[in-house]
Every structure is written in C-alpha cells, then in structure tokens.
Interface confidence: medium
C-alpha cells in the first residue's frame, strides 16, 4: 500500500552474506533403502549464503564452502522396539559469499 | 552413511527460536494491477521462528509477532524512463517462539 509513509523506516537491503539457517535432516540422507527408522535430531543449524545483490544480473552465491560431518541417531524400529545406532550426515556450511553474475545460456543461432 | 564416526561431532538440534531470514519483496505486495515496475530493495531481513522441538507432536510457531512498515522504492517504467515513487510494505517479525501442539483433526465417526 502507499499509505502510512511517515511511520515507515526506509527498507534496508538484506546484504549478501552468511546467515544461520535450519537444515532438515531427511531420512534418505542416511538410508535410501529403508524407511523403517527415525532420525534425531530432525534438524540442525547450518551457515548459508542469502540476501540480495545491488544488481539484477547477479546472484548471492557461496564462494567458499566447508563440509561438516555430524553424528545423528538412527532409531530403527524392529518389532515395535527401537534400536539406537549412530549415523553420519555431512552438512554443507557456507563460509563466504559473493555476488556472482548469472550466466544465461545464449540462444543457438 | 554409518562410516567415519570418529571425526563427526554429535549433531545439535536447531532449537525453536527466532532467526534472521531474508524476505523477498514481491511486486504484488505493492501493486497487484500492474507489473510494469521494479522494487528496491528486492529483499530485506526479517526475524522468523525456525527450528525443531523435542517432541514429535509439536511444531515451532511464533507466539508473538510484530508488524513493521518499511518504505521501498517503486520504480515505474513509463516510456522507457524510470519514475521513482515511495511505497510501504508491511513486514512481519516474529518476536517470540514456542513449541505448539499440532492439532490433527479427528476423523468423523
């Protein structure tokens, strides 16, 4: 809306940088062959690049990433009883970001 | 995978709390009748509840919200020339979060 301008502060661009995000740990990251288990914790924090760039033709992208293995519980349900095992999930953290030109493929002439 | 357990730290649950997120300001928030304009900035930071709860039947939800009006530039393109106007967009910030029971509708018997 165009109303109530006086009370509104000028919007500040969300700069392109790393922010803490929540990553859902899906079961197929651990075992694609079996669905009869639960994962704990179901979500973890990761660092990810987000935000906008000063130009329409550029995009906020990770310029440096780090893989971080973490242990989760794989809770298998066998005959209605749980069996607790450890599993390793590798998370991707973004360490640095940059505004990168979007390369659009040229049409073939 | 169940390999390389030694190097991996135990995963820590992403607790239910407010985190800084990036909100894309879509054009239809400003004017649904006209697509012939740009918005600046294209994205801003907001506070939003995210994360997981310690229980299967609960979900991380906002328990307190605040509406925050911000001024953006509406850049209309008229005869290939830009016309700058102000517009107000109301953002929703989450101030507090809680793990709330998911109410699943009971089947009608």
């Amino acid at each position: 809306s165009l109303g109530s301008l006086a009370a509104a502060e000028p919007a500040v661009i969300a700069e392109c940088k790393t922010r803490t995000e929540v990553f859902q740990i899906s079961r197929n990251l651990i075992d694609r062959t079996n669905a009869n288990f639960l994962v704990w914790p179901p979500c973890v924090e990761v660092q990810r690049c987000s935000g906008c760039c000063n130009n329409r033709n550029v995009q906020c992208r990770a310029s440096q990433v780090q893989m971080r293995p973490v242990q989760v519980r794989k809770i298998e349900i066998v005959r209605k009883k749980p069996i607790f095992k450890k599993a390793t999930v590798t998370l991707e953290d973004h360490l640095a970001c940059k505004c990168e030109t979007i390369v659009t493929p040229r049409p073939v002439t | 995978s169940l390999g390389s357990l030694a190097a991996a730290e135990p995963a820590v649950i992403a607790e239910c709390k407010t985190r800084t997120e990036v909100f894309q300001i879509s054009r239809n928030l400003i004017d649904r009748t006209n697509a012939n304009f740009l918005v600046w900035p294209p994205c801003v930071e907001v506070q939003r509840c995210s994360g997981c709860c310690n229980n299967r039947n609960v979900q991380c939800r906002a328990s307190q919200v605040q509406m925050r009006p911000v001024q953006v530039r509406k850049i209309e393109i008229v005869r290939k020339k830009p016309i700058f106007k102000k517009a107000t967009v109301t953002l929703e910030d989450h101030l507090a979060c809680k793990c709330e029971t998911i109410v699943t509708p009971r089947p009608v018997t």
Epitope: W40, R73, P82, F84, K86 | P10, N54, N55, R56
Partner: antibody, heavy 120, light 107 residues
Framework: EVQLLQSGGGLVKPGGSLRLSCAAS????????MSWVRQAPGKGLEWVSY????????YYADSVKGRFTISRDNSKNTLYLQMNSLRAEDTAVYYC?????????????WGQGTLVTVSS | SYELTQPPSVSVSPGQTASITCSGD??????VHWYQQKPGQSPVLVIY???KRPSGIPERFSGSNSGNTATLTISGTQAMDEADYYC?????????FGGGTKLTVLG
C-alpha cells in the same frame, strides 16, 4: 523449580504389591519420556522400565517383565510404577528419571529415590 | 543381553587425570552417557552423547567413544570428584548400565 518428587516406597512381604509415584514439576511433563531405575543396597544402577512421552511405548527389563507396569497420567504430571509379585531381589532404592526427548536419550533429571524393601 | 564392563575402582592423585573406561561390543555404534553418584545421593548426568557436557558440569569432565570402548576423562581431578561413575547406553530397547567404577582421590 524443575524437580521429580517420589513417594510410595516401604516394606512389603514377598508376593505383595506396591505402587510408586513420581510427581513432576517445573517442566512440561507430557513432552518427556520417563524411566524407572533401581539400585540394590551396595550395588550398581539397573534400568527397570521406560515409557514414551504419550505412553504409547513401554519397555521393561527382563527381570521385571510381567510383574511391573509403568504408566503415566500427563494431566496430573505423574509417573507410576505398579509392582506386583514382589521378590526379595526387588529390594532397592527406586529412582524415577527424565529423558530429554520423546524417544529416550540420556537421563538428565532424577528423583530423590524411594526405598522398597521386600522381606517377610 | 548387552553388557557394559567397567573397572570396579580407579585411584588418582589430586590434580592428576583420571580415566574410567566402559567396554561393550561395538559400543562406538551407540551413544554413551556417564553418571556420577555420591554416597546417599541420586545420580547426576556428567556426560551425554559420548562427549557432551550438560550445563553446570565443570570443563574438566570429558568423554570419548570409539570401537568397543568409551572413556570418561577427569582432568585436574579434585577431592569433590570422588564418587561412583556409571556408563550407560540405550541399545536394543533397553537402557544398559555398566557395573560402576569407584573413583578414589588419594591424599
């Protein structure tokens, strides 16, 4: 204050019954799994029974299976252990304890313990 | 049934490092927790998920777990650390405790 307050212990004859209670306060009881753990005089800790947050899952140590029943009343914030057909070897201090998650995990809060003596 | 084995006793001089082991078949595949119990008191969680420390537990307590052995390490042991220590793991639908280790702080 976050605590577990136990009651119901005492002296009982072999073959007799007893019900232990564990009243929770200071936290949302219905969000946590609970267990009973016992300790015979001068001995180590022995896990007895587990119940999930909503009471749908219950597990028992082989030594008490068929004789002990774990239950909970989330509306009263209370955990119970019904002990039947008691034997001399059930003599122990019984602790109720809280798991931080619905599925179990470590025991992060313990009751003060209550002594159960089975003797004729 | 699954068994966890601990040494009955460990002695250490004040200020030294005490290590208490807990062994079980493929124990590294399970999360191990450690409890401290002083005479006449309820147990207290000191390490969970192999190596995590609950709030309020001093930094001198640490843990590790791989292969068939989990270890509780107390660095700079103090007289107040004298207690019984129990390892625990949730395996096949039951919580299993080790037999316990009596830690004696000499002097």
């Amino acid at each position: 204050e976050v605590q577990l307050l136990q009651s119901g212990g005492g002296l009982v004859k072999p073959g007799g019954s007893l019900r232990l209670s564990c009243a929770a306060s200071g936290f949302t009881f219905s969000s946590y799994a609970m267990s009973w753990v016992r300790q015979a005089p001068g001995k180590g800790l022995e896990w007895v029974s587990y119940i999930s947050d909503d009471g749908s899952l219950k597990y028992y140590a082989d030594s008490v299976k068929g004789r002990f029943t774990i239950s909970r009343d989330n509306s009263k914030n209370t955990l119970y252990l019904q002990m039947n057909s008691l034997r001399a070897e059930d003599t122990a201090v019984y602790y109720c304890a809280r798991h931080p998650y619905w599925y179990g995990g470590q025991l992060d809060l313990w009751g003060q313990g209550t002594l159960v003596t089975v003797s004729s | 049934s699954y068994e966890l084995t601990q040494p009955p006793s460990v002695s250490v001089s004040p200020g030294q490092t005490a290590s208490i082991t807990c062994s079980g078949d493929s124990l590294g595949s399970y999360f191990v927790h450690w409890y401290q119990q002083k005479p006449g008191q309820s147990p207290v969680l000191v390490i969970y998920d192999d190596s995590k420390r609950p709030s309020g537990i001093p930094e001198r307590f640490s843990g590790s777990n791989s292969g068939n052995t989990a270890t509780l390490t107390i660095s700079g042991t103090q007289a107040m650390d004298e207690a019984d220590y129990y390892c625990s793991a949730f395996t096949h639908n039951s919580d299993v405790f080790g037999g316990g280790t009596k830690l004696t702080v000499l002097g």
